[in-house]
């Protein structure tokens, strides 16, 4: 019986675990891993905590090991080219003899500290209309942005700042499936910069 595709998220340069979750390791004969090509074979080892891995593709040499008793597969020192579909064909002693588990590996960078850029739109009667833009250093996939304390989503925030709001701090949190990071700017700093005639501000 073939399974659904299980999404696995990994961090560039770090390790990821494919959850095979074998419940009866005594019945496993061999597990064949394939991606774009054959990746590895995993067979029972005399140490029940460490099945034996035979890597079949040079791109994975010295980067793969398996964990007992569940046969979970670990790829370390992740590269962007490791991303894609993986298949584990599990051959057992018992009917149905072969079952297949499928995975999709997504790889992301661990996010660095985002930068907040401000642009003055207008300043009237002690109220400043400011646009804050939050961005991470490299253009990344699947990055979402959130602003507190307003709860706004998206990387752009428009603010109508009054003197009474001076104590507020605006925090942008950038997040992807594997990490998050934040930066803040104070309202006092925003309007002070405007009063001094600055048009933009970079934090950090």
């Amino acid at each position: 019986k073939d399974s659904e595709i299980f999404t696995v998220n990994g961090i560039l340069g770090e390790s990821v675990t494919f959850p095979v979750n074998i419940q009866e390791p005594r019945q496993v004969k061999i597990i064949a891993w394939t991606s774009k090509t054959s990746v590895a074979y995993v067979t029972p080892g005399d140490s029940e905590t460490a099945p034996v891995v035979t890597v079949t593709h040079r791109n994975y040499y010295e980067r793969i090991h398996a964990l007992g008793p569940n046969y979970n597969l670990v790829i370390s020192d992740l590269r962007m080219e490791d991303a894609g579909d993986y298949k584990a064909d599990i051959n057992t002693q018992a009917d149905p003899y072969t079952t297949t588990k499928r995975y999709n590996l997504q790889i992301y960078r661990r996010l660095g500290k985002p930068k907040i850029t401000q642009s003055l739109m207008a300043s009237v009667n002690s109220t400043c209309n400011v646009t804050l833009t939050c961005s991470v250093e490299k253009e990344e996939k699947n990055v979402t942005y959130n602003w507190s304390p307003l709860g706004e989503e998206g990387n752009v925030l428009q603010i109508f700042q009054t003197p009474e709001d001076q104590e507020l701090t605006y925090t942008c949190t950038a997040q992807n499936p594997v990490s998050n990071n934040s930066d803040s700017i104070s309202a006092r700093q925003l309007c002070a910069d405007i009063a001094m005639g600055f048009r933009t501000h970079h934090t950090g």
């Epitope: 019986k1 399974s3 979750n21 419940q23 009866e24 390791p25 005594r26 019945q27 004969k29 067979t43 029972p44 080892g45 005399d46 029940e48 008793p69 057992t92 002693q93 018992a94 149905p96 079952t99």
Partner: antibody, heavy 117, light 112 residues
Framework: EIQLVESGGGLVKPGGSLRLSCAAS????????MHWVRQAPGKGLEWMGW????????TLADDFKGRFTFSLDTSKNTAYLQMNSLKIEDTAVYFC??????????WGKGTTVTVSS | EVVMTQSPGTLSLSPGERATLSCRSS???????????LEWYQQKPGQAPRLLIY???NRFSGIPDRFSGSGSGTDFTLTISRLEPEDFAVYYC?????????FGPGTKVDIK
């Protein structure tokens, strides 16, 4: 404390059906496989097979394929043994047994099935 | 299928005596990973079996050290060094190396 409690046994006529339940508590149900073992009156133990509690994939010993099926309700932490076309020789105590990868560590007390006309 | 045989069928002994129970498999039960998954279970009347020994010689948690297991390949032994009153029961060996997994017919240890 880990516990397995079987229920659903009773008297049934040949050709009839019965569904046995095994309610598990005290551990994460979907981490370990659940096995079924039966014991005819005055006889030894017979391994029937097991079910993967994470995927629902059953493995039955050849002698039990066809008339017997394993299933789960993970929301109730319960495993089931469905027995159809029962024969007099299916009369036995039926045990559910938790595996701990390399051995059976917890057994239920068993439920008695009597097939008689 | 691996057939497990046990001898003797019944062993009549007194408390304090040594019990030696034998189990033999019809073929080697060394698993492909090199381990031997031979277990011993104890069953008292009206109760479920309980695990005593796994992987030939490893005592399960809470099992007294008067119980010991030994053997290799196809011949295995359970030894109870000094029988206590609570040890009188039926003992089953079991192999979990080759599917279908199989139990022996049991050895009954009763009071002489």
């Amino acid at each position: 404390e880990i516990q397995l409690v079987e229920s659903g046994g009773g008297l049934v006529k040949p050709g009839g059906s019965l569904r046995l339940s095994c309610a598990a508590s005290g551990y994460t149900f979907t981490t370990y496989s659940m096995h079924w073992v039966r014991q005819a009156p005055g006889k030894g133990l017979e391994w029937m097979g097991w079910i993967d509690t994470a995927t629902g994939e059953p493995t039955l010993a050849d002698d039990f394929k066809g008339r017997f099926t394993f299933s789960l309700d993970t929301s109730k932490n319960t495993a089931y043994l469905q027995m159809n076309s029962l024969k007099i020789e299916d009369t036995a105590v039926y045990f559910c047994v938790k595996s701990a990868y390399w051995y059976f560590d917890v057994w239920g007390k068993g439920t008695t099935v009597t097939v008689s006309s | 299928e691996v057939v497990m045989t046990q001898s003797p069928g019944t062993l009549s002994l007194s408390p304090g005596e040594r019990a030696t129970l034998s189990c033999r498999s019809s073929q080697s039960i060394v698993h492909i990973n090199g381990n031997t998954y031979l277990e011993w279970y104890q069953q008292k009347p009206g109760q479920a079996p309980r695990l005593l020994i796994y992987k030939v010689s490893n005592r399960f948690s809470g099992i007294p050290d008067r119980f010991s297991g030994s053997g290799s390949g196809t011949d295995f032994t359970l030894t109870i060094s000094r029988l206590e009153p609570e040890d009188f029961a039926v003992y089953y060996c079991f192999q979990g190396s080759h599917v279908p997994w199989t139990f022996g017919p049991g050895t009954k240890v009763d009071i002489k």
